[in-house]
């Protein structure tokens, strides 16, 4: 019974259960391909438990291996949009600190209006994740169509 | 050593490890866009540990944040079929209780025959998840092509 | 405090936190549709904590329910390429021991150049997972475009 009690008494953060699910706030101005995210119960079903938002980008607070997942749906899309503006690409990566900058996950919209994927990756406290959408396409802000999240899996 | 022993002695359900992976049973009658699911070791590799099925829909038994994932493949499909009948749309949502009804995840088959995605979302005991497939194309019942599951992640 | 200490003192493997994320090494010779994987910190962001590689295929070391995920991007590809060479199909399955051989997850590239999906499935110690890519198109070896991983979820 002791474990169950300990589990309840310790703050969840100390168990390493960092998790976040974000919804799209807005796209960047010209020359800024980043998507800007928001999260919190007041906004609906998005949340941050551990990680934080820094100017719309997700910052990691705990070292570990994370499952990173994303879905982006285009609000302005055509059967030829994806191929005409090709390659319209979504990339998720560590954008700061600069010394750790790397692309983690990349997908193109090939005659499709939605991309979705996920992967496991090591992240460190202070890593900021950016999601770059290249091309002149506008993502949907519907919370069931466009979302981005991370889940701490293990140290 | 105490933790390892405690972990083995306590029933897994008390650790909050609710998880389910379902396979397609059948589609609904006309005017009912829902997919009806089934699960259990007798059926193959599907299972329910915690959540339950209620008339083919998945009912949650434990409050928490869940990873919800789905893949649906259309049975009689080619790129041209998909675009002609397009957009066949799949939506996963809470359908009961009515007071909590909301769409959690939505995808269209855009000149493609498979959609797959996943997301983190808070769910409460008693929430029933429905998967609605709108359009005239039939989903495959192959267990490696069409499946739906949830995994409890944290309180 | 006792639980937190116990958690740190016990080897992670004893907590059942088996996890792996692999990057593509190479494709097989003719008549061998398997993708050959590699992993380890020296290679970048791939890793194996628990599972092992056996001639480029992933072997499971702990019984349990796993989340299996994969993304494969075709290297020389356009919407028309994908449909012209259609059906290029990716299947993830247990390939040994032969008695447990089964397809777990299957996807086709329909006018698209990337597939990504995930599913929960029971796996047993000794199961070897193979990823078969049928068709004449080559997968990208970029680590942000093609990857394959598993995460132990519960016993």
């Amino acid at each position: 019974q002791r474990f169950a009690q300990a589990q309840q008494q310790l703050p969840l953060e100390s168990l390493g259960w960092d998790v976040a699910e974000l919804q799209l706030n807005h796209t960047g101005p010209q020359q800024d391909p980043r998507l800007y995210w928001q999260g919190g119960p007041a906004l609906g079903r998005s949340f941050l438990h551990g990680p934080e938002l820094d100017k719309g980008q997700l910052r990691i607070h705990r070292d570990g291996i994370y499952m990173v997942h994303i879905q982006v749906t285009l609000a302005i899309c055509s059967s030829t949009t994806a191929s005409r503006h090709h390659p319209t690409t979504l990339a998720v990566g560590i954008c700061s600190p600069a010394s750790r900058s790397i692309s983690l996950l990349r997908l193109s919209f090939h005659q499709g209006c939605t991309i979705a994927s996920q992967r496991l990756t090591p992240l460190a406290r202070g890593d900021t994740l950016c999601t770059n959408l290249t091309g002149t396409l506008l993502p949907s802000r519907n919370t069931d169509e466009t979302f981005f999240g991370v889940q701490w899996v293990r140290p | 050593q105490r933790f390892a022993q405690a972990q083995q002695q306590l029933p897994l359900e008390s650790l909050g490890w609710d998880v389910a992976e379902l396979q397609l049973n059948h589609t609904g009658p006309q005017q009912d866009p829902r997919l009806y699911w089934q699960g259990g070791p007798a059926l193959g590799r599907s299972f329910l540990h915690g959540p339950e099925l209620d008339k083919g829909q998945l009912r949650i038994h434990r409050d928490g944040i869940y990873m919800v994932h789905i893949q649906v493949t259309l049975a009689i499909c080619s790129s041209t079929t998909a675009s002609r009948h397009h957009p066949t749309t799949l939506a996963v949502g809470i359908c009961s209780p009515a007071s909590r009804s909301i769409s959690l995840l939505r995808l269209s088959f855009h000149q493609g025959c498979t959609i797959a995605s996943q997301r983190l979302t808070p769910l409460a005991r008693g929430d029933t998840l429905c998967t609605n497939l709108t359009g005239t194309l039939l989903p495959s019942r192959n267990t490696d092509e069409t499946f739906f599951g949830v995994q409890w992640v944290r309180p | 405090q006792r639980f937190a200490q116990a958690q740190q003192q016990l080897p992670l493997e004893s907590l059942g936190w088996d996890v792996a994320e692999l990057q593509l090494n190479h494709t097989g010779p003719q008549q061998d549709p398997r993708l050959y994987w590699q992993g380890g910190p020296a290679l970048g962001r791939s890793f194996l904590h628990g599972p092992e590689l056996d001639k480029g295929q992933l072997r499971i070391h702990r019984d349990g329910i796993y989340m299996v995920h994969i993304q494969v991007t075709l290297a020389i590809c356009s919407s028309t390429t994908a449909s012209r060479h259609h059906p290029t199909t990716l299947a993830v399955g247990i390939c040994s021991p032969a008695s447990r051989s089964i397809s777990l997850l299957r996807l086709s590239f329909h006018q698209g150049c990337t597939i990504a999906s995930q599913r929960l499935t029971p796996l047993a110690r000794g199961d070897t997972l193979c990823t078969n890519l049928t068709g004449t198109l080559l997968p990208s070896r970029n680590t942000d475009e093609t990857f394959f991983g598993v995460q132990w979820v519960r016993p």
Partner: antibody, heavy 120, light 108 residues
Framework: EVQLLESGGGLVQPGGSLRLSCAAS????????MSWVRQAPGKCLEWVSA????????FYAESVQGRFTISRDNSKNTLYLQVNSLRAEDTAVYYC?????????????WGQGTLVTVSS | EIVLTQSPGTLSLSPGERATLSCRAS???????LAWYQQKPGQAPRLLIY???SRATGIPDRFSGSGSGTDFTLTISRLEPEDFAVYYC?????????FGCGTKVEIK
């Protein structure tokens, strides 16, 4: 109260140019994608162009691609449409319209329109 | 591009009657992303329905939308005097975003 007020229309010769403006008030302008939609006398509505809330992405109907340019100044809460190389078939009432918050181009608020007449 | 065909061109009805307006697409509309607007002479269009069946803010419940794929319907359950106008459907699933040419609902 959301308000959209177009201006800048008028009579112009074929090949000529105009700059249409749309002054917005009553909402956070930079949070919304905007479009121009036109309606020729007695004809159907036709979507012309769209721009994201930040101004970073622009979209055009094929009939105006290369001739029209959409832009916005979020500091002035104003949407613009620069129309060049005008043709007789561009004669229409031009409406500015706000996209739904989702960014999808269905239009929850419209201006009253400004008439552009292309004639020699 | 997706062509939207509205029928009938004109609908002559009396107040209190039920109006059924049809909009047919030349190909399936992605996500059932179809909207309905009302336009009165000299005025801008007004959004009634989006997503084929969701009523816009402030729209009376006598207006309802239905349909999916290629066939969509706007129903006005009991016509009020202020409902006599031209009604347009619009698909916004794929660019270019196209409108039907309207159904005029006039007093019989």
């Amino acid at each position: 109260e959301v308000q959209l007020l177009e201006s800048g229309g008028g009579l112009v010769q074929p090949g000529g140019s105009l700059r249409l403006s749309c002054a917005a008030s009553g909402f956070t302008f930079s949070s919304y994608a905007m479009s121009w939609v036109r309606q020729a006398p007695g004809k159907c509505l036709e979507w012309v162009s769209a721009i994201s809330g930040s101004g970073g992405s622009t979209f055009y109907a094929e009939s105006v691609q290369g001739r029209f340019t959409i832009s916005r100044d979020n500091s002035k809460n104003t949407l613009y449409l620069q129309v060049n190389s005008l043709r007789a078939e561009d004669t229409a009432v031009y409406y500015c319209a706000r996209h739904d918050y989702s960014n999808y181009p269905y239009f929850d608020y419209w201006g009253q329109g400004t008439l552009v007449t292309v004639s020699s | 591009e997706i062509v939207l065909t509205q029928s009938p061109g004109t609908l002559s009805l009396s107040p209190g009657e039920r109006a059924t307006l049809s909009c047919r697409a030349s190909q399936s509309v992605r996500g059932n992303y179809l909207a309905w607007y009302q336009q009165k002479p000299g005025q801008a269009p007004r959004l009634l329905i989006y997503g084929a069946s969701s009523r816009a803010t402030g729209i009376p419940d006598r207006f309802s939308g239905s349909g999916s794929g290629t066939d969509f319907t706007l129903t006005i359950s009991r016509l009020e005097p202020e409902d006599f106008a031209v009604y347009y459907c619009q698909q916004y699933g794929y660019s270019p975003f196209t409108f039907g040419c309207g159904t005029k609902v006039e007093i019989k």
